[in-house]
């Protein structure tokens, strides 16, 4: 099994631009999670999906952030417009 696959591995953008992060969960997993990690704020759960349905997006109250899971094998996290403080490592995870 390839595990969870994210793209891109690295992203550099200008302030104000749109950023889209992509995730392919492990096949057969029905829950998907997006996290953000920074030195200042630690690890934050942004949103999670169960059976492609968003269950809790309270970790991203700014409407610059949006996430979709159109099918069981693909999810996107979009930031529009991006800000310098969005610089972070973004993790996607999946579980049964």
């Amino acid at each position: 099994d390839a595990g969870v696959i994210q793209s891109p591995r690295h992203e550099v953008t200008e302030m104000g631009q749109e950023v889209t992060l992509r995730c392919k969960p492990i096949s057969g997993h029905n829950s998907l999670f997006w996290y953000r990690q920074t030195m200042m704020r630690g690890l934050e759960l942004l949103i999670y999906f169960n059976n492609n349905v968003p269950i809790d997006d309270s970790g991203m109250p700014e409407d610059r952030f949006s996430a979709k899971m159109p099918n069981a094998s693909f999810s996107t996290l979009k930031i529009q417009p991006s800000e310098p403080r969005d610089s972070a490592v973004y993790f996607c995870a999946s579980s049964l």
Epitope: L43, E44, S58, G59, P61, E62, D63
Partner: antibody
């Protein structure tokens, strides 16, 4: 029926502390982010702080950072706001509100905080 | 911080009038949210994501706009609509409200 009930307000001297509480019922509290908003007498609304469902994401108004601390206890269905080093300008009605529809879809009735010597 | 400026700050109108309140943002926002507040009461959500009516809100209320300028329109004022209205942005923290528009009976 969604209900939010604030408590803990009162009269406090400048430099003092208060802890506000917001008791939630009628919905699954642990699934929702929560806000604090305040309104000084005769003035408009001012956003204070936000906390996500599991407390991993927290935001504050810039002017309040370091003096106010938001927290929640999902086992007690309660939201808190710890307010330290209070000033006269913190005098206001403090509301808790549930995050829903991307906004604040349910509000409590408010609790009054008066900072005066 | 993104400053929201509402205009007018005060508005006198009569029952049956069509009223429009404008909310201008100092920086572009994705959406605007509108609240109604009556004296001594908590605010009530009216419109979310710029144009969606909150549950139970009458269809005479509508919202529109994009970028830096948004509007709340009441197509035919009813006696219960006389209140203060606030816009808010959630595009970027810290979240900010407009200063309010007080709608009074003429």
């Amino acid at each position: 029926e969604v209900q939010l009930v604030e408590s803990g307000g009162g009269l406090v001297q400048p430099g003092g502390s208060l802890r506000l509480s917001c008791a939630a019922s009628g919905f699954t509290f642990s699934n929702f982010g929560m806000h604090w908003v305040r309104q000084a007498p005769g003035k408009g609304l001012e956003w204070v702080s936000y906390i996500s469902s599991g407390s991993s994401t927290i935001y504050y108004a810039d002017t309040l950072k370091g003096r106010f601390t938001i927290s929640r206890d999902n086992s007690k269905n309660t939201l808190y706001l710890q307010m330290n080093s209070l000033r006269a300008e913190d005098t206001a009605v403090y509301y808790c509100a549930r995050r829903g529809e991307g906004a604040m879809d349910y509000w409590g009735q408010g609790t009054t905080v008066t900072v005066s010597s | 911080d993104n400053q929201l400026t509402q205009s007018p700050s005060f508005l006198s109108a009569s029952v049956g009038d069509r009223v429009t309140i404008t909310c201008r943002a100092s920086s572009s926002v994705n959406y605007i949210y509108w609240y109604q507040q009556k004296p001594g009461k908590a605010p009530k959500l009216l419109i979310y994501y710029t144009s969606n009516l909150a549950p139970g809100v009458p269809s005479r209320f509508s919202g529109s706009g994009s970028g830096n300028e948004y509007t709340l329109t009441i197509s035919s004022l009813q006696p219960e609509d006389f209140a203060t209205y606030y816009c808010e942005q959630f595009t970027s923290s810290p979240f900010t409200f407009g200063q309010g528009t007080k709608l009074e009976i003429k």
